[in-house]
Interface confidence: medium
C-alpha cells in the first residue's frame, strides 16, 4: 500500500464490510478490518465505559496501515456506530452495527446513567429520548407518566429512530415526571430504562444595564456597570461582556444570582463590571449579553470618558421664545457639561425661585404665562468641580390673542327702536397688533339661542357685512386707536344707518396669537317705547315713573313686569327674545293707563324709590293684528342717597381792582345739592358784576372793587344736610374815584 504524501488527497480508509449497516445476532463475534494510507484508530459505542478487555484492536499481519476490531460474544448494547479514522483528521469510514437481541432490544448508552431528559416548553422544540434500538425496525411507543399517556410515531413530528431514539415535541411531555420507551416483539413487551423529565426554562425577559444610556466620567474615576437579567424559573444563565479596551487587567467581572422576591415568577441574575480607574481608552460601547442556552438577550450603553471637567451650552438653545398668554411655557436648558452643572435662573437680573407659577431647574416652566412674565431670562450654569460659569439670555415674548373689551360687560338688554340709527363697537386689545377686524351678520331668526352657554348665540353660518343682501344698511368706520387702561387698543365701529331687521352682529379680530370674537344681539322692535320721568337719573326716596308708550292702533294689553332674580326660567327658552316667551315667570306690576290722541301710556309710579327698585323692567304690548307680543326691556338704575360733600379745596385768592375773580365750588351728593353763596355770612345775590352759573357752582365777579374783598362761603345742601367751604378774596390797589357828571 502506498504512503500518502503531503498534498495528496487523502482517501477514507476501507472497511472489510461493504455495507453501511450490518446486522448480526447476539452472542456472535463481530470482526471488521480497516485498511488505509496512514495511522488508523477505531471508535466504537460506549467506548469510555467498556474498557478495552472486551474489544480487541489488533494489527493486521499483511499491511502496515491496517487494524482489525474484534468483539466476541456481542450483546444488544454493542449496537451502534463503529468508526475507523486517520489520527488527527476528520477522514473516516463508519459502519452501523445492529446486534439483534430480542431479550434486550433497547441499548443503554453511557449518558443514560443519569436517565434525565431536559426539555423546554417551546411549541417548536422537539426532544429526543435516547432509547436507541439494537433492532432497526422495531415498533416503539413512548410512555409518559403520571397521568399515564402513550405516544405512537405518526410519521410527522413523533418518530423513533434506532440510531437516535424517540423524537417528540417537548411540550407534549412537559407535564410528565418520567418517560420510557416500549417495544413489542412476538407478543413480548420490552421497556427501556426510565428517563426523568426535567423542564428547563430558557426565556430571558429582559436585560437591563445600570446606569442606562450614556455614562459620563472623568479620567481616573471608577466605572461600575450592573447588568441584570430577568428570566423565567429553572434557567441557567451565562453572561459575557464586550468592551472597547483590550487591556483586561484593570477590569473585574462578578456574576451572581439575585434572590427572587417571594411570589415572583422570575429569576434574577446580576453581572457587575468594574473598572477602578478609567482612562480615555475605556471610552466606547459596553455590551452585556445573557445566554440561557436557547435564548440570547443583550443591552448596551456608552461610556464617555472626559479628560477633564467642562461646561458649554448646546447649539439648540433659543434666544427668543414666543408664547400665547395662558399657555404653559417651557424653556429647556441644553448644555454639554461634565459633571452636571448647577443651574440658576434670573429674570431681568433677579434670581428666580420655584413657586406655584414658575418651576426652575433643567428647564424653566411658567405654568400659565401672563403678559407680566415677558422679559429677559438669563440662565447661568456652574461646573461644580471647575467652578467655570456660562450664561445665556432668552427673551420671552408673550402674545395675546385678541381680547374684546365689551365681552367683559353684561350685554345691555335694551332693544333697538325700528328705523333708528345705531352704533356697535368692538374695542380690541391684542399683542402683536391685529391683522384685521372683520364684521359679520346674520338674521336673528336664522340663529338659535341657548342662554346657559358661554356664547348663547349659535348661527350655522355668518355673512360678511360686505354681503349686502338682506340686512340693515351698514357702514364700518375706519378703525380708531386709543390708549385705554395703559394699553393700545383698536376700536372698530359698525354704524347701522337704519334699524329695520333684528340681527346678530359679530366682530372677529385676528392676530398671530389667535382670534377673538364678540356677538352682539341687535333686536329691533317697532313697538312700544319706554321713558323715565323725570329724565334725570333717579335717586332713592325720590318720586319717579316708568312710562311705556304704544300706538293705540297697533298695540293693546300693555303690561309692566319686573325681571327679578326669581325669574330664572326666563333663560330656558330658545328664542332670541326669551323674555317675551316667559312673561308668566315674571313679576307683574300694577300700572295706570293714560291715553292721548294716538297712544296708550302705561305708567308705573315709584313714590319713594329705593335701591330694591333697581333692575330690568319689561313692557309688554300685544300686536292687535298678529297677536304677537312685543317686549321692551329697560334697565333702571337708582342712585344711592349721599349727603353733600365739597370735593375739592377753595383756594384763597388775591387780585387787583378791576380784574375778574372766578371760583368753582366742586360738590357731590344725591339728590344733586342746591348751592348758595354767602359773603361775610350774607347771601350773595346776582347783579351786573356777580354772575352765578352751572347751578350756582361757578361764581364770577367781574371788575372787582375794594368792597368785593371778604370771606366767601359756598354752601351745598340736599335732604341729607349741608356742606360748606370758605375762601378769602383779598383785593389790592387803590379804588379810583368815579366821576359822575
Amino acid at each position: 500500500a502506498s504512503v500518502g504524501l503531503p498534498g495528496d488527497s487523502l482517501h477514507p480508509p476501507k472497511l472489510s464490510t461493504q455495507k453501511d449497516i450490518l446486522t448480526i445476532l447476539a452472542n456472535t463475534t463481530l470482526q471488521i478490518t480497516c485498511r488505509g494510507q496512514r495511522d488508523l484508530d477505531w471508535l466504537w459505542p460506549n467506548t469510555p465505559r467498556d474498557s478495552e478487555e472486551r474489544v480487541l484492536v489488533t494489527e493486521c499481519g499483511d499491511s502496515i496501515f491496517c487494524k482489525t476490531l474484534t468483539v466476541p460474544r456481542v450483546v444488544g448494547n454493542d449496537t451502534g456506530a463503529y468508526k475507523c479514522f486517520y489520527r488527527d483528521t476528520d477522514v473516516s469510514s463508519i459502519v452501523y452495527v445492529y446486534v439483534q437481541d430480542h431479550r434486550s432490544p433497547f441499548i443503554a448508552s453511557v449518558s443514560d446513567e443519569h436517565g434525565i431528559v431536559y426539555i423546554t416548553e417551546n411549541k417548536n422544540k422537539t426532544v429526543v429520548i435516547p432509547c436507541r434500538g439494537s433492532i432497526s425496525n422495531l415498533n416503539v411507543s413512548l410512555c409518559a407518566r403520571y397521568p399515564e399517556k402513550r405516544f405512537v410515531p405518526d410519521g410527522n413530528r413523533i418518530s423513533w429512530d434506532s440510531e437516535k431514539g424517540f423524537t417528540i415535541p417537548s411540550y407534549m411531555i412537559s407535564y410528565a415526571g418520567m418517560v420510557f420507551c416500549e417495544a413489542k416483539i412476538n407478543d413480548e413487551t420490552y421497556q427501556s430504562i426510565m428517563y426523568i423529565v426535567l423542564v428547563v426554562g430558557y426565556r430571558i425577559y429582559d436585560v437591563v444595564l445600570s446606569p442606562p444610556h450614556e455614562i459620563e466620567l472623568s479620567a481616573g474615576e471608577k466605572l461600575v456597570l450592573n447588568c441584570t437579567a430577568r428570566t423565567e424559573l429553572n434557567v441557567g444563565l451565562d453572561f459575557s461582556w464586550q468592551f472597547p479596551s483590550s487591556k483586561h487587567q484593570h477590569k473585574k467581572i462578578v456574576n451572581r444570582d439575585v434572590k427572587s422576591l417571594p411570589g415572583t415568577v422570575a429569576k434574577m441574575f446580576l453581572s457587575t463590571l468594574t473598572i477602578d480607574s478609567v482612562t480615555k481608552s475605556d471610552q466606547g460601547e459596553y455590551t452585556c449579553t445573557a445566554y440561557s442556552g436557547l435564548m440570547t438577550k443583550k443591552n448596551k450603553t456608552f461610556v464617555r470618558v472626559h479628560t477633564k471637567p467642562f461646561i458649554a451650552f448646546g447649539s439648540g438653545m433659543k434666544s427668543l421664545v414666543e408664547a400665547t398668554v395662558g399657555s404653559q411655557v417651557r424653556i429647556p436648558v441644553k448644555y454639554l457639561s461634565y459633571p452636571a452643572p448647577d443651574i440658576k435662573w434670573y429674570r431681568n437680573g433677579r434670581p428666580i425661585e420655584s413657586n406655584y407659577t414658575m418651576i426652575v431647574g433643567d428647564e424653566l416652566t411658567i405654568m400659565e404665562v401672563s403678559e407680566r412674565d415677558a422679559g429677559n431670562y438669563t440662565v447661568i450654569l456652574t461646573n461644580p468641580i471647575s467652578m467655570e460659569k456660562q450664561s445665556h439670555m432668552v427673551s420671552l415674548v408673550v402674545n395675546v390673542p385678541p381680547q374684546i373689551g365689551e365681552k367683559a360687560l353684561i350685554s345691555p338688554m335694551d332693544s333697538y327702536q325700528y328705523g333708528t340709527m345705531q352704533t356697535l363697537t368692538c374695542t380690541v386689545y391684542a399683542n402683536p397688533p391685529l391683522h384685521h377686524i372683520q364684521w359679520y351678520w346674520q338674521l336673528e331668526e336664522a340663529c338659535s339661542y341657548r342662554p346657559s352657554q358661554t356664547n348663547p348665540y349659535t348661527c350655522k353660518e355668518w355673512r360678511h357685512v360686505k354681503d349686502f343682501q338682506g340686512g340693515n344698511k351698514i357702514e364700518v368706520t375706519k378703525n380708531q386707536y386709543a390708549l385705554i387702561e395703559g394699553k393700545n387698543k383698536t376700536v372698530s365701529t359698525l354704524v347701522i344707518q337704519a334699524a329695520y331687521v333684528s340681527a346678530l352682529y359679530k366682530c372677529e379680530a385676528i392676530n398671530k396669537a389667535g382670534r377673538g370674537e364678540r356677538v352682539i344681539s341687535f333686536h329691533v322692535i317697532r313697538g312700544p317705547e319706554i321713558t323715565v320721568q323725570p329724565a334725570t337719573q333717579p335717586t332713592e326716596r325720590e318720586s319717579m315713573s316708568l312710562l311705556c308708550t304704544a300706538d293705540r292702533n297697533t298695540f293693546e294689553n300693555l303690561t309692566w313686569y319686573k325681571l327679578g332674580s326669581q325669574a330664572t326660567s326666563v333663560h330656558m327658552g330658545e328664542s332670541l327674545t326669551p323674555v317675551c316667551k316667559n312673561l308668566d315667570a315674571l313679576w307683574k306690576l300694577n300700572g295706570t293707563v293714560f291715553s292721548n290722541s294716538t297712544n296708550d301710556i302705561l305708567i308705573v309710579a315709584f313714590q319713594n324709590a329705593s335701591l330694591q327698585d333697581q333692575g330690568n323692567y319689561v313692557c309688554s304690548a300685544q300686536d292687535k293684528k298678529t297677536k304677537k307680543r312685543h317686549c321692551l326691556v329697560k334697565q333702571l338704575v337708582i342712585l344711592e342717597r349721599m349727603a353733600p360733600m365739597i370735593t375739592g379745596n377753595l383756594e384763597n385768592q388775591t387780585t387787583t381792582i378791576g380784574e375778574t375773580i372766578e371760583v368753582v365750588c366742586p360738590t357731590s351728593g344725591n339728590p344733586t345739592p342746591l348751592i348758595t353763596w354767602f359773603k361775610d355770612n350774607e347771601t350773595l345775590v346776582e347783579d351786573s358784576g356777580i354772575v352765578l352759573k352751572d347751578g350756582n357752582r361757578n361764581l364770577t365777579i367781574r371788575r372787582v372793587r375794594k368792597e368785593d374783598g371778604g370771606l366767601y362761603t359756598c354752601q351745598a345742601c340736599n335732604v341729607l344736610g349741608c356742606a360748606r367751604a370758605e375762601t378769602l378774596f383779598i383785593i389790592e390797589g387803590v379804588q379810583e374815584k368815579t366821576n359822575l357828571e
Partner: antibody, heavy 115, light 108 residues
C-alpha cells in the same frame, strides 16, 4: 341652484288688478330681502318694491306707492306683488329678484294694461 | 332721492378694445352701495359687480368696478363679442333704489 319663477302676468284693463307670484328655491328664502323690478318694452330697468326678510319692512317706488303691495310667505318660499288701479304705464316685464343688489333674477312675467 | 346717470348712451368698439362705462350719482352713495348689471336681448339682467368693486361669482376678471362717492366706473379690459349688451348701474344705498338709464355696448 337658486331659482326664481314668476307667474300671474297677463292682459288687464286700466283700473284692474293682478297678483304676481314668485316661487323661490335653492336658498334660504327667509334670510333675504326680495324685490320686484320692471322693464317697459324697449326701456331701461325700474325698481318697483322691496321687502325685508321677515316681512316687517317694505319700500316702494313713488310711481306705485299706494297702488301696489309687496308681501311674502316664508313658509311657502313665495314673494307676491298685489297690483291695484293698474295704468297703461304699468305695462312691462316684471322681474322677481333677490337682495338689495339683485344677484339672482327670474325670467320675468309680462303685464299688459290695455283697454 | 338719488338719481343715477350713465354715459355714454352707446359705445361702439372692436373686439380686444377697452371699454370704460361711467355712472354718476346725484348724491354720495355711502359704503359703495353700487352694483353693475349686464342685460342681453331677451334675457334677464345678471349682476357683474356689487359694492362698487367686488366681482360677482363667475364673472371674468376682465370686468372691473371702481369709484366711490358719486363717480363710478365699469371697465371691460379686452372686449369679446359676447360682451355686446346693455349695462346698467344701480344704487342700493337708500330707498327708493334706482337704476341708471343704461349704456349700450356694440361690438363692431
Amino acid at each position: 341652484e337658486v331659482q326664481l319663477l314668476e307667474s300671474g302676468g297677463g292682459l288687464v284693463q286700466p283700473g284692474g288688478s293682478l297678483r304676481l307670484s314668485c316661487a323661490a328655491s335653492g336658498f334660504t328664502f327667509s334670510w333675504y330681502v326680495m324685490g320686484w323690478v320692471r322693464q317697459a318694452p324697449g326701456k331701461g330697468l325700474e325698481w318697483v318694491s322691496s321687502i325685508y326678510p321677515s316681512g316687517g319692512a317694505t319700500n316702494y317706488a313713488d310711481s306705485v306707492k299706494g297702488r301696489f303691495t309687496i308681501s311674502r310667505d316664508n313658509s311657502k318660499n313665495t314673494l307676491y306683488l298685489q297690483m291695484n288701479s293698474l295704468r297703461a304705464e304699468d305695462t312691462a316685464v316684471y322681474y322677481c329678484a333677490r337682495g338689495n343688489y339683485f344677484d339672482y333674477w327670474g325670467q320675468g312675467t309680462l303685464v299688459t294694461v290695455s283697454s | 332721492d338719488i338719481q343715477m346717470t350713465q354715459s355714454p348712451g352707446t359705445l361702439s368698439l372692436s373686439p380686444g378694445d377697452r371699454a370704460t362705462l361711467s355712472c354718476r350719482a346725484s348724491q354720495s352713495v355711502s359704503s359703495n352701495y353700487l352694483a353693475w348689471y349686464q342685460q342681453k336681448p331677451g334675457q334677464a339682467p345678471r349682476v357683474l359687480i356689487y359694492g362698487a368693486s367686488t366681482r360677482a361669482t363667475g364673472i371674468p376678471d376682465r370686468f372691473t368696478g371702481s369709484g366711490s362717492g358719486t363717480d363710478f366706473t365699469l371697465t371691460i379690459s379686452r372686449l369679446e363679442p359676447e360682451d355686446s349688451a346693455v349695462y346698467y348701474c344701480q344704487q342700493f344705498d337708500s330707498s327708493p333704489l334706482s337704476f341708471g338709464g343704461g349704456t349700450k355696448v356694440e361690438i363692431k
